[in-house]
Interface confidence: low
């Protein structure tokens, strides 16, 4: 990723083009950072990846840093919240953006405890902010379903993150082709499935439907 | 600034009980961190004991687990080890450290960046 | 346990030189892997962390890479500061465990 350390002002509004945020708690001003095993909020001027989110497919969100995805534990939802493996079906990981809120299911929301971890828990209302955005929404930056070109799943939409090569890739990536074309995995695994296409160039114009579906003859 | 300083007596005798504390100062021990005790015999290298998080989950190295006790005492903001059965092998300057790290999916990724300035422990009678 | 064997277990050397030690895991340990440098008498500082990535503070002519099994850490320019041993050490499973480190000497 070359994160630095450090997150510059500068830095950070790069990666809020790419769609990756720090999460920040509007009323406690401190950031969500993921840690060995727990979330906790820390100040966010010491901004590393490890507070560097990203909306992904299926509703998940992914921490940079920690490579993984926030999970809702329903064998003990009210414990600290933690990131899990994003294909994991042990957890909820599934997160809905709403007025500020962060809600998973049965009326879950991401709060903070006395301690500064990071819970979810159904009884108040905490709002998160996009850190560096001017009290921006971090509904701002949720999903978009990418949809591939040529590869073998027949414009499937990217599977973001995906497993490949030992890491998670929230984004395309050149990563094993040596003619430089970017591309994604349509399944979580792609070691596993083998399935993927290309990545639409975004500096092209708008990619047509023939480029991405086979014409019936 | 986090800082570690470990106490305890300097010498045990053989089959006795090595008892050290390491005191964190300028942090809290319950933030999401492990705490680890690594040792380092007189001319020798580094070997990690264990360590525990503030929750009192543990870690210990398998070659010492039947001797090895690491506790936290979160109002006192510090956490302790006990050596059992102790012979002249146990030896050593022994370290607390502060590991700091991230888990990766579900694989822990991690590293010791704050370490106590270290206690000499003489087995002997 | 994972072990972890470093070479050369010491080496002289003479400033301004370039040098080079290997830590070889006995199983993959993707790039979980650590390097700290110990002064006589002093307590061990973390250089390198992740393989790859220098910590804060850590003059830039130390340098880590290696993946895997293979891991190298490289003083670019050998300064009177930097004799000391070095170790590497692993956490991608618990027990966290060290090479037997390293003796940089002068020459």
């Known amino acids: 990723e070359g994160v630095a350390a450090a997150l510059t002002p500068e830095r950070l509004l790069e990666w809020q083009d790419k769609g990756i945020f720090v999460i920040q708690s509007e009323s406690l001003k401190k950031c969500i950072q993921a840690g060995k095993s727990v979330l906790t909020l820390e100040n966010c001027k010491q901004a590393n990846k490890h507070m560097l989110w990203k909306w992904v497919s299926n509703h998940g969100l992914f921490n940079i840093g920690g490579s993984g995805c926030l999970g809702l534990n329903f064998s003990a939802p009210e414990q600290p919240l933690s990131l899990y493996e994003c294909d994991s079906t042990l957890v909820s990981l599934r997160w809905r953006c709403n007025r500020k809120m962060i809600t998973g299911p049965l009326q879950y929301s991401v709060q903070v405890a006395h301690d500064n971890t990071v819970v979810a828990s159904r009884k108040y209302i905490h709002k998160w902010i996009s850190y560096g955005s001017g009290g921006g929404d971090i509904c701002e930056y949720l999903h978009k379903d990418l949809h591939t070109i040529k590869g073998n799943t027949h414009g499937m939409p990217c599977m973001f993150p995906f497993q490949y090569n030992h890491q998670w890739h929230h984004e395309c990536t050149r990563e094993g082709r040596e003619d430089d074309l970017l591309w994604c995995a349509t399944t979580s695994r792609y070691e596993r499935d083998e399935k993927w296409g290309f990545c639409p160039d975004p500096t092209s114009a708008e990619v047509g439907c023939d480029t991405i579906w086979e014409k019936d003859l | 600034q986090i800082t570690l300083k470990e106490s305890g007596p300097g010498l045990v005798k053989p089959s006795g009980t090595l008892s050290l504390t390491c005191a964190v100062s300028?942090?809290?021990?319950?933030?999401?961190?492990?705490w680890s005790w690594v040792r380092q015999p007189p001319g020798k290298g580094l070997e990690w004991i264990g360590e525990i998080y503030h929750s009192g989950s543990t870690n210990y190295n398998p070659s010492l687990k039947s001797r090895v006790t690491i506790s936290v005492d979160k109002s006192k903001n510090q956490f302790s080890l006990k050596l059992s059965s102790v012979t002249a092998a146990d030896t050593a300057v022994y370290y607390c450290a502060r590991d700091d790290g991230w888990r990766y999916g579900s694989v822990y990724y991690y590293y010791m960046d704050v370490w106590g300035k270290g206690t000499t422990v003489t087995v002997s009678s | 346990d994972i072990q972890l064997t470093q070479s050369p277990s010491s080496l002289s050397a003479s400033v301004g030189d370039r040098v080079t030690i290997t830590c070889r895991a006995s199983q993959s340990i993707d790039d979980h892997l650590n390097w700290y440098q110990q002064k006589p008498g002093k307590v061990p500082k973390l250089l390198i962390s992740?393989?790859?990535t220098l910590q804060s503070g850590a003059p830039s002519r130390f340098s880590g890479s290696g993946y895997g099994t293979d891991f190298t850490l490289t003083i670019s320019s050998l300064q009177v500061e930097d004799f000391a041993t070095y170790y590497c050490q692993q956490s991608y499973s618990p027990p966290q465990t060290f090479g037997q480190g390293t003796k940089v000497e002068i020459k």
């Open positions: 300028g942090g809290s021990i319950s933030s999401s961190n492990w």
């Open positions: 992740s393989a790859s």
